[in-house]
């Protein structure tokens, strides 16, 4: 969770306690295990047609 007193991160970014700054959620594609990725919106579920062809 974000550190107390920190300004909220802008849309598309999330607070990293490890790095002590807001980080782009886009980087979770390359580094999905980063702490801040937990705060990024989960990818929408695949359409039913992809799950059950």
């Amino acid at each position: 969770e974000q550190a107390p007193g920190q300004a909220p991160c802008s849309r598309g970014s999330s607070w990293s306690a490890d790095l002590d700054k807001c980080m782009d959620c886009a980087s979770c594609r390359a580094r999905p295990h980063s702490d801040f990725c937990l705060g990024c919106a989960a990818a929408p579920p695949a359409p039913f047609r992809l799950l059950w062809p």
Epitope: G12, D18, L19, M23, D24, C25, A26, S27, R29, A30, R31, H33, S34, A43, P44
Partner: antibody
């Protein structure tokens, strides 16, 4: 503030070797991917090599043009990045930049070190 | 490898002009959520500087006259009102896959 300082450039004969170093400060070096990017005189930017993290077993990637000749490495205890360049060719003549990034976009750049390969 | 084609390769403009630089990738570098395209500025004798990442995210400290847009294969860097310090060469770069590749650059010169 973030600082990347390259060293080790110079004049070398074709077929020779050179080792570049990059000293990093001002950011959590061990958490950042690192690359070397070069720029031939009057030309554009070319990515050369990348090294990832200890948690990635220090995975490395290379441009085809340097594969088998160049080796990238890092020493997290010294906040340092290296590029061992062997079998150098005239076309390797360039300014070599050390870059640091969490992923994707190269946030941090050094001032560059010039490598000249000539007889 | 993904090829990056920048245009124009050079342009002449005056202070206050609106400047647009385009970059086309040989294949898509976007997901449904994000585009893996970045823009850099380089002044003579200096290292490149990151301006915009993920197509449209302005790097901290970069003036708001710079903006980026696009998705898929076509991307644009816009300088809304060119300032004297903006005369430089601009490069796009993708991070979709290895190898990372840069565009050939666009040199913005004084008219």
């Amino acid at each position: 503030q973030v600082e990347l300082v390259e060293s080790g450039g110079g004049l070398v004969q074709p077929g020779g070797s050179l080792r570049l170093s990059c000293a990093a400060s001002g950011f959590t070096f061990s958490s950042y991917w690192m690359s070397w990017v070069r720029q031939a005189p009057g030309k554009g930017l070319e990515w050369v090599a990348e090294i990832r993290l200890k948690s990635d077993n220090y995975a490395t990637h290379y441009a085809e043009s340097v594969k088998g000749r160049f080796t990238i490495s890092r020493d997290d205890s010294k906040n340092s990045l290296y590029l061992q360049m062997n079998s150098l060719r005239a076309e390797d003549t360039a300014v070599y930049y050390c870059t640091g990034y969490y992923a994707d976009a190269m946030d941090y750049w050094g001032q560059g070190t010039l490598v000249t390969v000539s007889s | 490898d993904i090829q990056m084609t920048q245009s124009p390769s050079s342009l002449s403009a005056s202070v206050g002009d609106r400047v647009t630089i385009t970059c086309r990738a040989s294949q898509s570098v976007s997901t449904s959520s994000y585009s893996y395209m970045h823009w850099y500025q380089q002044k003579p004798g200096k290292a490149p500087k990151l301006l915009i990442k993920y197509a449209s995210n302005l790097e901290s400290g970069v003036p708001s006259r710079f903006s980026g847009s696009g998705s898929g294969t076509d991307f644009t860097l816009t300088i809304s009102s060119l300032q004297p310090e903006d005369f430089a060469t601009y490069y796009c770069q993708h991070s979709w896959e290895i190898p990372y590749t840069f565009g050939g650059g666009t040199k913005v010169e004084i008219k």
